[in-house]
Each structure stands twice: as structure tokens, then as C-alpha cells.
């Protein structure tokens, strides 16, 4: 049964994972940002389900396309480079969702946007938040 | 209601320079990219280049770098693209045209201006 | 440089279902736009993202992607259907835009 000094710490992970996930969508969704309609065009997969901390498979295999797209924001948008700032997201997920477990990650028919990917993903570290709390 | 209306075509003999305008309204002009678009008579539609809403990004199709140049005055509203060194390929109709809301679709366009190039 | 290939023609009769593609190497990591362009008019955008509608669109136009290739469905096609309809995307890198030869849809 997990203790609750590794529920904190995931709590925290998660909590870092959303500040992440949020800075990125607060430094491209805005129309200060000269290459939104750019980045709109890359296409990212969804989970077909995401509730559990083993569906951070999903957006671990989504990284990369992340930083393409990123690759394309002026660094001032960020206070890290793109490699940087997703290697720092690849830890923590790596870190929630184990190494010992194999999941196989399902994709919804639809894809997304930036935009409404990040918004996605957001979303489940809040309702995995809110169920820690 | 959004409105492009594009000036500054006409005939020009080849080697020569023209420059193209496009007006907007109806939009914070300053908010959004902008494209320009040709087509020549009876063939396809070919991006040509586009700009950034702030003019600091600029993109252009191969067969127009190094001799066209798109930019933008967003206190007037208006985009331009300078057109140099013309040839006869490039006789077509422009259109400027621009996403809006948050898609990276050409939602507006104007109606075009025909450039003719030739001796 | 980036190309994506759509049929020259397409013919359809009246009521039938249209359906029109457009293929590229980089389509299954880059959106797919659909424009409509009459006689003598402006084109219109008729589907972004692959398979959104814009306002104003009927229900009859429908978009839909498969790795490498775009398609636009025509529904129940009508005699005002008859256009010239062009894809449009991204190259690999995002920074190229590029449209299709363009498909002439002929109702008959």
C-alpha cells in the first residue's frame, strides 16, 4: 500500500508536471505568440482513456512531437530550451507511471492541437491531484 | 464584418518590380498572421509567403526567396508584398489572406488582384 | 521540396457520395485543410484539422486523415458542388506551406 510520504511525493511530481504542462500552454496560447497558427498545424495523438498514473504512457510517447513543435517557439517564451524543458517532463513521467510496468498506450480516433493536447493532459493531473488530496 | 482588399496589380515587363497591397478590417489586424497566395490563370493555388502578426517571422515558398518580400504595417492595417526581379511565371492573381480564431486556416480572403508579367 | 498529390478529376452523379484525396509523407503529423474554389471566386475554407467544419459549412462536406493521406467527402452531391477543391498542409518541418494540384469535381 502506497505511504503517505510516496503519496506526497507523487503529489508533488504531479504538481510539477501541471506547472510544466501549464507554462507551455501559457507561453504559446496567446496571440503575442508569432507562431501559433505554425504550431497549430502539428497533429498530436489523445489517450483513449486517461485515469491512472500508467496512462502517463501516453503522453511519454507524445514528447516528441512536443519538442518539435516547441522547437519552433522563440526561447524567450520559455526559461528552458525546448530539450531541456521536455527531458525535465520525460523524468517526472518516467518517475509517475514506473519503468517495471509494460502499458501499452490506446489512442483515441480523434487527434489534437497543441492546445487542446496540453489542455488535456492538464486536466488529468488535476483529477489525479484532486484524488490524492 | 472582415474585409481584405488587395491594390497595386497591373501589367509590368519582366526584370521589373511591383509592390502589392492588402488592406484589412473588420479584425485586430495585429492579432494574426497573414499569407499571400497566387494563382495563375487556369492552374492551381500556390502559397507564396506569410507573415507573423508582429512581422518578426517571415516564410517564403522556393520559387519566390530572395526575390519577394512580404511585411506589414500594423498601425495602417495594410500588408505588402514587394515584388522583384518579376518573370513571366509570375502572372497570376494574388489573394492575402489570413487565419482567425485559433485555427491555422485561411478563413478570409480577399477577391485577388491580377499581376501581368510580360514584355 | 514538399508535395501533396490530389487527383486532377473526380466525377460524380447527382446524389451520390464524392470523395477526393490528398497524400504527403508528413499528413500524419500535420493537420489537413480543405479549400472550395468556384468559377471566377476567392477559395473557401471548408475543413481544417482534418476534419473540423467551419460555420457555415454544410454537413454534406466531410473531412477525414489516414496516415499519409486526407480525404474530402462529398455527400449527396449537388450541381453546386461542382468546384475545383485544393488540401493544404505543412511540410515536415512546419515551416513551408503547400498546396495540392487541386481536384476538379464534375457532377453529372
Known amino acids: 500500500a502506497p505511504t503517505s510520504s510516496s503519496t506526497k511525493k507523487t503529489q508533488l511530481q504531479l504538481e510539477h508536471l501541471l506547472l510544466d504542462l501549464q507554462m507551455i500552454l501559457n507561453g504559446i496560447n496567446n496571440y503575442k505568440n508569432p507562431k501559433l497558427t505554425r504550431m497549430l498545424t502539428f497533429k498530436f495523438y489523445m489517450p483513449k482513456k486517461a485515469t491512472e498514473l500508467k496512462h502517463l504512457q501516453c503522453l511519454e510517447e507524445e514528447l516528441k512531437p512536443l519538442e518539435e513543435v516547441l522547437n519552433l517557439a522563440q526561447s524567450k517564451n520559455f526559461h528552458l530550451r525546448p530539450r531541456d524543458l521536455i527531458s525535465n517532463i520525460n523524468v517526472i513521467v518516467l518517475e509517475l507511471k514506473g519503468s517495471e510496468t509494460t502499458f501499452m498506450c490506446e489512442y483515441a480516433d480523434e487527434t489534437a492541437t497543441i492546445v487542446e493536447f496540453l489542455n488535456r493532459w492538464i486536466t488529468f493531473c488535476q483529477s489525479i491531484i484532486s484524488t490524492l488530496t | 464584418e472582415v474585409q481584405l482588399v488587395e491594390s497595386g496589380g497591373g501589367l509590368v515587363q519582366p526584370g521589373r518590380s511591383l509592390r502589392l497591397s492588402c488592406a484589412a478590417s473588420g479584425f485586430t489586424f495585429s492579432y494574426y498572421g497573414m499569407h499571400w497566395v497566387r494563382q495563375a490563370p487556369g492552374k492551381g493555388l500556390e502559397w507564396v509567403a506569410d507573415i507573423s502578426n508582429d512581422g518578426s517571422n517571415k516564410y517564403y515558398a522556393d520559387s519566390v526567396k530572395g526575390r519577394f518580400t512580404i511585411s506589414r504595417d500594423n498601425s495602417k492595417t495594410t500588408l505588402y508584398l514587394q515584388m522583384n526581379s518579376l518573370r513571366p511565371e509570375d502572372t497570376a492573381v494574388y489573394y492575402c489572406?489570413?487565419?482567425?480564431?485559433?485555427?491555422?486556416?485561411?478563413?478570409?480572403w480577399g477577391q485577388g488582384t491580377l499581376v501581368t508579367v510580360s514584355s | 521540396s514538399y508535395e501533396l498529390t490530389q487527383p486532377p478529376s473526380v466525377s460524380v452523379s447527382p446524389g451520390q457520395t464524392a470523395r477526393i484525396t490528398c497524400s504527403g509523407d508528413a499528413l500524419p503529423k500535420r493537420f489537413a485543410y480543405w479549400y472550395q474554389q468556384k468559377a471566377g471566386q476567392a477559395p473557401v475554407l471548408v475543413i481544417y484539422e482534418d476534419n473540423k467544419r467551419p460555420s457555415g459549412i454544410p454537413e454534406t462536406l466531410s473531412g477525414s486523415s489516414s496516415g499519409t493521406t486526407a480525404t474530402l467527402t462529398i455527400s449527396g452531391a449537388q450541381e453546386e458542388d461542382e468546384a475545383d477543391y485544393y488540401c493544404?498542409?505543412?511540410?515536415?518541418?512546419?515551416?513551408?506551406?503547400?498546396f495540392g494540384g487541386g481536384t476538379k469535381l464534375t457532377v453529372l
Open positions: 489572406a489570413t487565419p482567425y480564431y485559433d485555427s491555422s486556416g485561411l478563413d478570409y
Open positions: 493544404y498542409s505543412t511540410d515536415n518541418t512546419g515551416g513551408l506551406w503547400v
